[in-house]
C-alpha cells in the first residue's frame, strides 16, 4: 500500500435544505483507471462509512441508489454532495481515495471536512 496526498476543505456549512458539497482532490502518482472514493464520518469515538463509489477515469461516479451521496469527477478532483443532513449529522467527513487499478494500490486519506448542519427553524403560523 502506497501513500497518496488527498486535499479537502477544512469547513463546510450545509444549506438550509441539508445539502453539503465539497471537493476532494488527490495527487495521483500514476495513470489510474479505476478509483474508489469513500466518505467517512467521525463524531467523537464513532467512525462510520457514509458512502462509497468506484469509477473508471473519465466516467461518472456511481453511488448506490439509496445513498445520500452524489458526485462528479474531473481529472483528479471529485465533487461530492451529501444530502438529507440534519443537525445531528454534524461531524468530520473524511475523504478516502484508493487507486484500485492498475497496480500498485495507492491509498490517500484527507484530513476531513467539518460539516456543520443547522436545522431550519419552523416557520411560525401566520393568521391573516
Amino acid at each position: 500500500c502506497k501513500a497518496m496526498h488527498v486535499a479537502q476543505p477544512a469547513v463546510v456549512l450545509a444549506s438550509s435544505r441539508g445539502i453539503a458539497s465539497f471537493v476532494c482532490e488527490y495527487a495521483s502518482p500514476g495513470k489510474a483507471t479505476e478509483v474508489r472514493v469513500t466518505v467517512l464520518r467521525q463524531a467523537d469515538s464513532q467512525v462510520t462509512e457514509v458512502c462509497a463509489a468506484t469509477y473508471m477515469m473519465g466516467n461518472e461516479l456511481t453511488f448506490l441508489d439509496d445513498s445520500i451521496c452524489t458526485g462528479t469527477s474531473s481529472g483528479n478532483q471529485v465533487n461530492l454532495t451529501i444530502q438529507g443532513l440534519r443537525a445531528m449529522d454534524t461531524g468530520l467527513y473524511i475523504c478516502k481515495v484508493e487507486l484500485m487499478y492498475p497496480p500498485p494500490y495507492y491509498l490517500g486519506i484527507g484530513n476531513g471536512t467539518q460539516i456543520y448542519v443547522i436545522d431550519p427553524e419552523p416557520c411560525p403560523d401566520s393568521d391573516f
Epitope: D44, V50, K96
Partner: antibody
Framework: EVQLVQSGAEVKKPGASVKVSCKAS????????MDWVRQAPGAGLDWMGN????????SYNQKFKGRVTLTADTSTSTAYMELSSLRAGDIAVYYC?????????????WGQGTLVTVSS | DIVMTQTPLSLSVSPGEPASISCSAS?????MHWFRHKPGQSPQSLIY???ILASGVPDRFSGSGSGTDFTLKISRVEADDAGVYYC?????????FGTGTKLELK
C-alpha cells in the same frame, strides 16, 4: 510492532463487577480508538463499545444497558473495560481491538483475550 | 440495528476445493468486512472495505458485493482455513457482526 496485551482470566460472583485491562504498545495510544468485542461460548462476536483515548469520548452498544464503562489511562497507554451486574450470560472471552490504519483496515489488531467466568 | 445473516451456517470442504460464504444485511451498508476466528485464538482480519485483502492474507481469499448482499470466496481451501468466519458492518452504530459460518475440512 503494535501489541495489545490484556489482563488475565477472572472468576466473579453473580452481581459483581469485572475490570479488564488492555495495555497498548508500538504506537501512539491517543491516535486510535480502542474497541471491545466479546464472544460467549457457542455464540458469535458482539461489539460492546469503543473509546477515543484522546477525547475520552465513548460509544456503547445499548444491548449492555449501561452495564459497560470504558476508560483509558493515557499515562500508561492502557484501556479498561468494566462490566457490572455480572450474570451467567456474561461468561465470555473479552477482546480489545484496534484499527490497522486511521480510517482503514478495521480491527486489524487484537488483544489475546480475557476469559471472564461468572460462578457462585 | 443492522442485522447480518450469514449462509450457510456451516460448510465442509475438501482441500483444494472452493468455498463461498454469503452475508446479507438487513439494510444497505457501504462496505463489508470479514474476519476468521479459530478456537483459542484472537479473531483475524481477512478482508476489509468489501474487497481489500488484509496484510498477510493469501490471495486465495476474495470479497465482493454491494448494498445488502456480500460474498467471501476462497478459491482453493487449505487445512489452515478451518474456523468460524464473520462479516461485519460499520455503516451505523452499534457495529454488528454476522451470525458466523463454520468452515470444516473434509
Amino acid at each position: 510492532e503494535v501489541q495489545l496485551v490484556q489482563s488475565g482470566a477472572e472468576v466473579k460472583k453473580p452481581g459483581a463487577s469485572v475490570k479488564v485491562s488492555c495495555k497498548a504498545s508500538g504506537y501512539t495510544f491517543t491516535d486510535y480508538n480502542m474497541d471491545w468485542v466479546r464472544q460467549a461460548p457457542g455464540a458469535g462476536l458482539d461489539w460492546m463499545g469503543n473509546i477515543n483515548p484522546n477525547s475520552e469520548s465513548t460509544s456503547y452498544n445499548q444491548k449492555f444497558k449501561g452495564r459497560v464503562t470504558l476508560t483509558a489511562d493515557t499515562s500508561t497507554s492502557t484501556a479498561y473495560m468494566e462490566l457490572s451486574s455480572l450474570r451467567a450470560g456474561d461468561i465470555a472471552v473479552y477482546y480489545c481491538t484496534r484499527d490497522g490504519n486511521r480510517y482503514d483496515a478495521w480491527f486489524a489488531y487484537w488483544g489475546q483475550g480475557t476469559l471472564v467466568t461468572v460462578s457462585s | 440495528d443492522i442485522v447480518m445473516t450469514q449462509t450457510p451456517l456451516s460448510l465442509s470442504v475438501s482441500p483444494g476445493e472452493p468455498a463461498s460464504i454469503s452475508c446479507s444485511a438487513s439494510s444497505s451498508v457501504t462496505y463489508m468486512h470479514w474476519f476468521r476466528h479459530k478456537p483459542g485464538q484472537s479473531p483475524q482480519s481477512l478482508i476489509y472495505s468489501t474487497s481489500i485483502l488484509a496484510s498477510g492474507v493469501p490471495d486465495r481469499f476474495s470479497g465482493s458485493g454491494s448494498g445488502t448482499d456480500f460474498t467471501l470466496k476462497i478459491s482453493r481451501v487449505e487445512a489452515d482455513d478451518a474456523g468460524v468466519y464473520y462479516c461485519q458492518q460499520r455503516t451505523s452504530y452499534p457495529l454488528t457482526f454476522g451470525t458466523g459460518t463454520k468452515l470444516e475440512l473434509k
